[in-house]
């Protein structure tokens, strides 16, 4: 009988140890959850405050409606210009409308005067069609005014208030474009 009692006592003790372990695990888990929650809340607060404090466009970029534009201060060939824009998560300018063209040319007049600026327009070597980099065709009013006589690849650029074409390997300034951040109010 004594042996039976001690066996029960041992089983109870074992159960108690298991429950203590479970409680300890639960406490640890709860603490871990609380820490994670704190981290998540801090992360969200930081994100929200930085989003609230940040302007829709980065420094030295110009905003118009939903877009941000960067007018370069260096010259490069068309392909390098494209890569320079990608480095900032943007692309060479794609002009969608006459209103956007007017804004760009107006801004350029204020900033720099009459220089050449690469945009994201190039001519397909086979068909001769003009294409923006996303594969769309420019609207009829936004086709380059002159056809370049170059045997090499031909790309589009803006000068004054015109869209023109030139050998992609010539050096020009360039304009990058990306979406403006939405203000979180």
């Amino acid at each position: 009988k004594l042996l039976q009692v001690s066996t029960i006592a041992m089983q109870q003790q074992e159960k108690l140890i298991q429950q203590e372990r479970a409680l300890l695990n639960f406490t640890e888990w709860k603490r871990s959850c609380a820490l994670q929650m704190k981290y998540c809340q801090a992360f969200m607060q930081n994100s929200l405050s930085s989003a609230h404090n940040s302007s829709p466009c980065p420094n030295n970029w110009i905003q118009n409606r939903e877009s941000c534009y960067y007018v370069s201060e260096i010259w490069s060939i068309w392909h390098t210009s494209q890569e320079n824009c990608l480095k900032e998560g943007s692309t060479l300018l794609q002009i969608e409308s006459k209103e956007e063209m007017d804004f760009i040319t107006g801004s350029l007049r204020k900033i720099k005067g009459s220089y050449d600026y690469w945009v994201g327009l190039s001519q397909d070597g086979h068909s001769g069609r003009w294409l923006w980099q996303d594969g769309s065709s420019p609207s009829p009013g936004l086709l380059p005014a002159e056809r370049s006589q170059s045997a090499n690849q031909v790309c589009g650029y803006v000068k004054s208030n015109s869209l023109l074409s030139s050998n992609c390997s010539t050096w020009k300034y360039f304009i990058c474009e990306k979406y403006a951040l939405r203000s979180s109010v």
């Epitope: 890569e83 990608l86 480095k87 900032e88 998560g89 943007s90 990306k178």
Partner: nanobody, 117 residues
């Protein structure tokens, strides 16, 4: 540090399709855009498609309408779906992660694509 690893290359007949994948590991928040480049023997490396962190896609005129670039932010991968492949598409394909101005960009090791009958 960011590591990029391409996969999915191989041999395919003209008119066939391949899907390349570029997996990014490390501090990928520093990447503003990913581009797929290709280099055929004796030719310069050319950018064929790119996608920015805002999801803006660009293509070179030589692949427009045939190649599609896409990204999966959960898996941290950028894919290049290549359809209607031509022998002139044969090259080593590399993915490149564009960091900000004045920062060093990241390159993968490359994957070979061969289009021939």
């Amino acid at each position: 540090q960011v590591q990029l690893q391409e996969s999915g290359g191989g041999w395919v007949q003209p008119g066939g399709s391949l899907r390349l994948s570029c997996a990014a590991t490390g501090s990928i928040v520093s990447i503003n855009a990913i581009g797929w480049y290709r280099q055929a023997p004796g030719k310069q490396r050319e950018l064929v498609a790119s996608i920015t962190n805002q999801g803006i896609r660009n293509y070179s005129t030589s692949v427009m309408g045939r190649f599609t670039i896409s990204r999966d932010d959960v898996k941290n991968t950028v894919s290049l779906q290549m359809n209607s492949l031509k022998p002139e598409d044969s090259a080593v394909y590399y993915c490149k992660g564009f960091a900000g101005w004045g920062k060093e960009d990241y390159w993968g090791q490359g994957t070979q694509v061969t289009v021939s009958s």
